[in-house]
Interface confidence: low
Amino acid sequence: MLRWFLSHLLGVWLLLSQLPREIPATDDKKLKACGRDYVRLQIEVCGSIWWGRKAGQLRERRQISEPLAEVVPSSIINDPEILSLMLQSIPGMPQELRIATRSGKEKLLRELHFVLEDSNLNLEEMKKTFLNTQFEAEDKSLSKLDKHPRKKRDNYIKMSDKCCNVGCTRRELASRC
């Protein structure tokens, strides 16, 4: 049991070690983002951390080193044909980011982009639903919601509320990736 725990701890540490050493000053700027915009911002921030490139050709400047695949369990990589990492089963990863990994690093994916909106997104709805390209990617998606630890879900929800109501920084979002 201890060995199992320590190996997981090591895995988490290795994953965390992929995060950027430096975060640009702009990451401390408060941004307000609700619903679809919140998810876009989260993907923009997290996308650059996972892939070490500009997410959707937006403004991220973070770099990561390559050996991320080494610390991701092989069971996660469920399609060897595709170059991008299949991060499907990492808890807490936004649905959009999971979808996003399917199309390869080269495109950084259409699913990541937000072209439609739901103007009637109230706070309650936002707790269970986030929207992207008019694609609807629920907060871990309703069908998968119960598979995630309650605390993690609550934290995710609280962060979305915070970003929407009072604003949040990229640094804060990065800490959730």
Epitope: G35, S103, V115, T133, F135, E138
Partner: antibody
């Protein structure tokens, strides 16, 4: 790779019916809002109908020109969306595109309504 | 309904030129959340439309930075700073702020 493939187009007489299908792959279909858009020489691109996800109770929206005649539906288990078209008119002719959230578009299927 | 008026209908250019396409809406596309849902697409012959710009100015993944979008409220512009052969085709705007979603009539970008 994301794919949307329409089928079911063809030639139909005015007043007739036709059902279009769109098979999707490469993304989580059940979470997607799906739309039908058509292109005709007379009207250009024209939005026809939208069906939202189960989380949005599969709510549907229609263009005024097709309301009461066309029905959009989906089968999440088959990753497919459909457009049932009744009481077809000549002005319904065109290329019908299936689109996932206006980000993905299929290649389209040609519908010709003519006597 | 929001009527989308796009100009010009045809835009002859030389490679390397700048091209500018205008899209005007009959009503404001800005939503109460402050966002404006106006997208630009390119359709090449025999292909389905491809998304270039979403929410007025956000460049879609893989779209070169020669292509940019701007504007607000009812007036929007797509600019191509240095036209290349791959840019040729029909450009159109679409508003997805209000149901029914409506399209511009399209602008054909062609070689002079």
């Amino acid at each position: 790779e994301v794919k949307l493939e329409e089928s079911g187009g063809g030639l139909v007489q005015p007043g007739g019916s036709m059902k279009l299908s769109c098979a999707a792959s490469g993304f989580t279909f059940s979470d997607a809002w799906m739309d039908w858009v058509r292109r005709s020489p007379e009207k250009g691109l024209e939005w026809i109908a939208e069906i939202r996800s189960k989380a949005k109770n599969h709510i549907t929206y229609y263009a005024e020109s097709v309301k009461g005649r066309f029905t959009i539906s989906r089968d999440d288990s088959k990753s497919s969306v459909y457009l049932q078209m009744n009481s077809l008119r000549t002005e319904d002719s065109g290329i019908y595109y299936c689109t996932g959230g206006f980000a993905y578009w299929g290649q389209g299927t040609l519908v010709t309504v003519s006597a | 309904d929001a009527v989308m008026t796009q100009n010009p209908l045809s835009l002859p250019v030389s490679l390397g030129d700048q091209a500018s396409i205008s899209c005007r809406s009959s009503q404001s596309l800005e939503k109460s959340n402050g966002n404006t849902y106006l997208n630009w697409y390119l359709q090449k012959p025999g292909q389905s439309p491809q998304l270039l710009i979403y929410r007025v100015s956000n460049r879609f993944s893989g779209v070169p930075d020669r292509i940019s979008g701007g504007g607000s409220g009812t007036d929007f512009t797509l600019k191509i700073s240095r036209v290349e052969a791959e840019d040729l085709g029909v450009y159109f705007c679409v508003q997805v702020s209000h149901v029914p979603f409506t399209f511009g009539s399209g602008t054909k970008l062609e070689i002079k």
